[in-house]
Interface confidence: low
């Protein structure tokens, strides 16, 4: 058993049929010694008396808010949550496996630049009685600070018969060094509580591996005289790290016909312009990637040829 | 070539070669097996290789103030990785494929380190701890870790030389 926060405790249970459970001793936070009684949740049934209460926690029915009273007055509370371990593996019932980039991916994170700011998100089908708490650090044995905001519901989607809820959180490394080569990974820890079930999820990554630039901005076409060619130009996204002579991007320019089946013409360039042939009804798209480290490509920025 | 006593290196040549190193490091990576990139984020994984750290002067301001600190750090790292790629971690069992880019990568690391090394002036190079990869079962994992770290190292080096070529070239 360990304390999650003041008066909230997590009981770790090996979860198998007829498991013995965990013996837990609760102590009433009071100077009083006599006449103390204990109840669970809203029930008025007295579970025991005395300053301490010993319980065998085996299942969710044994979890909940234990309250000690004296003469009708509440003295203190202890909320017990359960953390299930099945076959040596902690349960992951609350969050949905996103399966990208691999199985058992519950948290996904992205950064738009090297500033030390990043966003993580996760999915669940649970709509109520759900709370999240996020902590992060750079490294784990001698952690350096990363400050995370509150997790918020960022999207709702319908998937077949189910509703899916996306939560996200923004974090910022306290003393980020954008130009340095990371040697210690960022660790992100999410505590999830659904009713009386506790679970925790972690992710470990280097910012460089989760970089995904915003799409190029100000994508423009300039027709070349007496030619089917156009000069495409664009700019670095505002959110990308500066100076651009140091934090350079590379670009992919694509000419795509109306039909998805049509052959795509692609050009790769380090410049912020390119000359391409603009076909009728086609569109021109440009996306960006870090020039020197193969993290994710941005989403496409597109303009029609006409 | 770089010249002794704090003169500028051949920024443009260094830029071209460092960008080539980035490409080679990424093309070499698939040859070390399908390990999970996200699971490599352990503190023990990369603490034995050189890193370009915050105080090494490789940020744009540091380069403007005195690029020598950063260039020496890059030089040390290049020598370190060149030795690693020439060690039995890469030359021993299990053998690399005959067309592996690791050979080219090794040669390019040496080329860039020589481009940075001033004539008649020897920077103190980083000593490599005794390597103990006599266990071939560890070599695949070591190659993976080294190439992953090298990708990150040469990315920073390439940024340094690109910025230098754009802003510090005579």
């Amino acid at each position: 058993i360990w304390e999650l926060k003041k008066d909230v405790y997590v009981v770790e249970l090996d979860w198998y049929p007829d498991a013995p459970g965990e013996m837990v001793v609760l102590t009433c936070d009071t100077p009083e010694e006599d006449g103390i009684t204990w109840t669970l949740d809203q029930s008025s049934e007295v579970l025991g008396s005395g300053k301490t209460l010993t319980i065998q926690v085996k299942e969710f029915g044994d979890a909940g808010q234990y309250t000690c009273h004296k003469g009708g007055e509440v003295l203190s509370h202890s909320l017990l949550l359960l953390h299930k371990k099945e076959d040596g593996i902690w349960s992951t019932d609350i969050l949905k496996d996103q399966k990208e980039p691999k199985n058992k991916t519950f948290l996904r994170c992205e950064a738009k630049n090297y500033s030390g700011r990043f966003t993580c998100w996760w999915l669940t089908t649970i709509s109520t009685d759900l709370t999240f708490s996020v902590k992060s650090s750079r490294g784990s044995s001698d952690p350096q600070g990363v400050t995370c905001g509150a997790a918020t519901l960022s999207a709702e989607r319908v998937r077949g018969d189910n509703k899916e809820y996306e939560y996200s959180v923004e974090c910022q490394e306290d003393s980020a060094c954008p130009a340095a080569e990371e040697s210690l990974p960022i660790e992100v820890m999410v505590d999830a509580v659904h009713k009386l079930k506790y679970e925790n999820y972690t992710s470990s990554f280097f910012i460089r591996d989760i970089i995904k630039p915003d799409p190029p901005k100000n994508l423009q076409l300039k027709p070349l005289k007496n030619s089917r060619q156009v000069e495409v130009s664009w700019e670095y996204p505002d959110t990308w790290s500066t100076p651009h002579s140091y934090f350079s991007l590379t670009f992919c320019v694509q000419v795509q016909g109306k039909s998805k089946r049509e052959k795509k013409d692609r050009v790769f360039t380090d410049k912020t312009s390119a000359t391409v042939i603009c076909r009728k009804n086609a569109s021109i798209s440009v996306r960006a990637q870090d020039r020197y480290y193969s993290s994710s490509w941005s989403e496409w920025a597109s303009v029609p040829c006409s | 070539r770089a010249v002794p006593g704090g003169s500028s290196p051949a920024w443009t040549q260094c830029q071209q070669l460092s960008q080539k190193l980035c490409t080679l490091a990424w093309s070499a990576h698939p040859l070390v097996g399908h390990m999970d990139l996200r699971e490599e984020g352990d503190e023990e994984t990369t603490n034995d290789v050189p890193h370009i750290q915050c105080g090494d002067g490789c940020d744009p301001q540091g380069l403007r103030d005195n690029s020598q600190f950063c260039l020496q750090r890059i030089h040390q790292g290049l020598i370190f990785y060149e030795k690693l790629l020439g060690s039995d971690i890469f030359t021993g069992e299990p053998s690399l494929l005959p067309d592996s880019p690791v050979g080219q990568l090794h040669a390019s690391l040496l080329g860039l380190s020589q481009l940075l090394q001033p004539e008649g002036h020897h920077w103190e190079t980083q000593q490599i701890p005794s390597l103990s990869p006599s266990q071939p079962w560890q070599r695949l994992l070591l190659r993976f870790k080294i190439l992953r770290s090298l990708q990150a190292f040469v990315a920073v080096a390439a940024r340094v030389f690109a910025h230098g070529a754009a802003t510090l070239s005579p």
């Epitope: 076959d87 040596g88 593996i89 | 097996g33 390990m35 999970d36 699971e39 490599e40 352990d42 503190e43 023990e44 994984t45 021993g92 069992e93 299990p94 053998s95 006599s134 266990q135 071939p136 079962w137 695949l140 994992l141 993976f144 870790k145």
Partner: antibody, heavy 120, light 113 residues
Framework: QVQLQESGPGLVKPSETLSLTCTVS????????VHWIRQPPGKGLEWIGV???????DYNPSLKSRVTISRDTSKNQFSLKLSSVTAADTAVYYC??????????????WGQGTLVTVSS | DIVMTQSPDSLAVSLGERATINCKPS????????????LAWYQQKPGQPPKLLIY???TRQSGVPDRFSGSGSGTDFTLTISSLQAEDVAVYYC?????????FGQGTKLEIK
């Protein structure tokens, strides 16, 4: 199917050299490493050494000065030689392969074992 | 060398009851690279070679009954037989293949009470 079979004399005199052969079938020698492990009667298991897919060897430091492992790939055979034997070398000797060729580890297939007694 | 300490040395459990065997290596067997624990469990019956039950600390070898499970990480590992059957009487060994030389635990003899 995968098979490993140890063979060799069951009795060796003290100070002589113990020689055993492991004949394997059902898997590629290019992809799997072969190990020798022994077990004194009524005691635990002790790893002796390995011959890697490339032909190089590694031995338990406690036996290194006396052990030689070699192979004849044309016959799918591996041999173990242990010199200057004493009664303490009396054991069941097993050959085993490790599960993955390039990233070795645990032993998934074992031979039946052969008992070697060191006695004059 | 990594020393593998098994406990208990012997164990008597009633049929249908749970049997638990522990293995404590003298150093961590968790690979920082791929987060695998380089530990395997073997069962050995009299006159037979050891048989692989569990590898990478918790992965059951194909064909092994699901009453056998492995758990743990780093320097603390457990083999659990959830409901002991008569055919489970044997000596059980843990093996570390994290570092050369490979080393086994001293073995745990499992009997029926």
């Amino acid at each position: 199917q995968v098979q490993l079979q140890e063979s060799g004399p069951g009795l060796v005199k003290p100070s002589e050299t113990l020689s055993l052969t492991c004949t394997v079938s059902g898997f590629s020698l290019i992809s799997y490493n072969v190990h020798w492990i022994r077990q004194p009667p009524g005691k635990g298991l002790e790893w002796i050494g390995v011959i890697w897919t490339g032909g190089s060897t590694d031995y338990n430091p406690s036996l290194k000065s006396r052990v030689t492992i070699s192979r004849d790939t044309s016959k799918n055979q591996f041999s173990l030689k242990l010199s200057s034997v004493t009664a303490a070398d009396t054991a069941v000797y097993y050959c085993a392969r490790d599960k993955y060729g390039l990233f070795p580890g645990y032993f998934d297939y074992w031979g039946q074992g052969t008992l070697v007694t060191v006695s004059s | 060398d990594i020393v593998m300490t098994q406990s208990p040395d012997s164990l008597a459990v009633s049929l249908g009851e749970r049997a638990t065997i522990n293995c404590k290596p003298s150093q961590s067997l968790l690979s920082s690279g791929n987060r695998k624990n380089y530990l395997a469990w073997y069962q050995q019956k009299p006159g037979q070679p050891p048989k692989l039950l569990i590898y990478y600390a918790s992965t059951r070898q194909s064909g092994v009954p699901d009453r056998f499970s492995g758990s743990g990480s780093g320097t603390d590992f457990t083999l659990t037989i959830s409901s002991l059957q008569a055919e489970d009487v044997a000596v059980y060994y843990c093996l570390q293949h994290f570092n050369y030389p490979w080393t086994f635990g001293q073995g745990t003899k499992l009997e029926i009470k």
